[in-house]
């Protein structure tokens, strides 16, 4: 390895060769490289029960190179580390460990979460949403005319998706009942005849009651506040006809 060790090896093994392979400055048949050419790193490679000296331009995975006056050598990273700058700073951990402040941890500290893609401990990111956009025009079956009862919808955007441990996003869609403008449909705008046209007029208070947007319900993940059984929904309708209630998509 270093100069003095090289001399010891030379005494032990008279067959030291100066015509060495692969970057060796001096070598022996038994021990392989004893010293390296300038800038190359000395490393010990295990072959069966024996360790052989090799000279490398960069150190293998799990090792880092250090330059001393008498030797450039490969030094082992810490046991849980795959790639490191030195013993203090790991840059990639072994499988099952997470990188945090240059160290490898089996669990991330409080306030951080494990990113299983990068295998790092990262800050928990909570959901962020924009302000609500304005309500859409009041429509029934896509038409904005000819019917007294319809629905209107408003949406907001997700600005920041949450990380695994982050707070879930609040609803991004809201739909409520509304009164369609009392204007006659033009030719081709007419809605379907039949049941809908014969329905009796709603009470005044019913014109702004929120109803579920079936599409948004299908695509939603429920959050606890949104879970209601049919009985509760009926009860709520009776009790609070005049409130605007949201049923929304959760991301």
């Amino acid at each position: 390895q270093n100069a003095s060790r090289g001399r010891r090896q030379r005494r032990m093994h008279p067959n030291v060769s100066q015509g060495c392979q692969g970057g060796c400055a001096t070598c022996s048949d038994y021990n392989g490289c004893l010293s390296c050419k300038p800038r190359l790193f000395f490393a010990l490679e295990r072959i069966g029960m024996k360790q052989i000296g090799v000279c490398l331009s960069s150190c293998p995975s799990g090792y880092y190179g250090t330059r001393y006056p008498d030797i450039n050598k490969c030094t082992k990273c810490k046991a849980d580390c795959d790639t490191c700058f030195n013993k203090n700073f790991c840059t990639k951990c072994k499988s099952g460990f997470y990188l945090h402040l240059g160290k490898c941890l089996d669990n991330c500290p409080e306030g951080l979460e494990a990113n299983n893609h990068t295998m790092e401990c990262v800050s928990i990111v909570h959901c962020e949403v924009s302000e609500w956009n304005p309500w859409s025009p009041c429509t029934k079956k896509g038409k904005t005319c000819g019917f007294k009862r319809g629905t209107e919808t408003r949406v907001r955007e997700i600005i920041q998706h949450p990380s695994a441990k982050g707070n879930l996003c609040p609803p991004t869609n809201e739909t409520r009942k509304c009164t369609v403008q009392r204007k006659k449909c033009q030719k081709g705008e007419r809605g379907k005849k039949g049941r809908e046209r014969k329905r009796k007029k709603p009470n005044k208070g019913e014109s702004k009651e929120a109803i579920p947007d079936s599409k948004s319900l299908e695509s939603s993940k429920e959050i606890p506040e949104q879970r209601e059984n049919k009985q509760q929904q009926k009860k709520r309708k009776v009790q609070d006809k005049q409130k605007s209630v949201s049923v929304s998509t959760v991301h």
Epitope: Y64, T66, R67, N86
Partner: antibody, heavy 116, light 107 residues
């Protein structure tokens, strides 16, 4: 938490000796190469000496070779710097530091003043 | 020994300024370069290693670049706590040597 605490500094006459100590805690001392780095008043940083993790090899800057000796006691987690034949130009704050290519962790330093 | 020369030796700047400190090596040191920050009466603190790798906890306004013999430390937007002395250090060769330092002062 890594802690390095130097002691042993003081005022000494030229030609006399001084022994600095550095008590280490918060890391596996016997795994790390250690060094002394000094800083003369109002000047820059200057590496002085390094000892490898097991104490088997030591390295010195030319101006202190033969006068300073770096040593370590891994059972006591302590690094030493024996300074003999001190000169006025050795006046500085002496820091002990982990030395693994870079100087990652530093002590608070101990002042050595060489003056008659 | 490899000589490390920093410029400027001192520099006055204001909070919010972008600041660049240069370090030149007397011979090729590849990417074996580190930067340290030292505040008055305190020990130095490692900021950057391998030219541009930031130590964890060091703000991202600090960055390093260069290779071979010419290197720079850049602070993109100076903060009050950044006023200090900065040193470069090469670890390609023994003895490991430092630049003479760049003192960053408030204008």
């Amino acid at each position: 938490e890594v802690q390095l605490v130097e002691s042993g500094g003081g005022v000494v006459q030229p030609g006399r000796s001084l022994r600095l100590s550095c008590a280490a805690s918060g890391f596996t001392f016997s795994d790390y190469d250690m060094a002394w780095v000094r800083q003369a008043p109002g000047k820059g940083l200057e590496w002085v000496a390094t000892i490898i993790y097991d104490g088997s090899r030591t390295y010195y800057r030319d101006s202190v070779k033969g006068r300073f000796t770096i040593s370590r006691d891994n059972s006591k987690n302590t690094l030493y710097l024996q300074m003999n034949s001190l000169r006025a130009e050795d006046t500085a704050v002496y820091y002990c530091a982990t030395h693994d290519k870079t100087f990652d962790y530093w002590g608070q330093g101990t002042m050595v003043t060489v003056s008659s | 020994d490899i000589q490390m020369t920093q410029s400027p030796s001192s520099l006055s700047a204001s909070v919010g300024d972008r600041v660049t400190i240069t370090c030149r090596a007397s011979e090729d040191i590849y990417s074996d370069l580190a930067w340290y920050q030292q505040k008055p009466g305190k020990s130095p603190k490692l900021l950057i290693y391998d030219v541009n790798s930031l130590i964890h906890g060091v703000p991202s306004r600090f960055s390093g670049s260069g290779s071979g013999t010419d290197f720079t430390l850049t602070i993109s937007s100076l903060q009050p706590e950044d006023f200090a002395t900065y040193y470069c250090q090469q670890y390609d060769n023994y003895p490991n040597t430092f630049g003479q330092g760049t003192k960053l002062e408030i204008k």
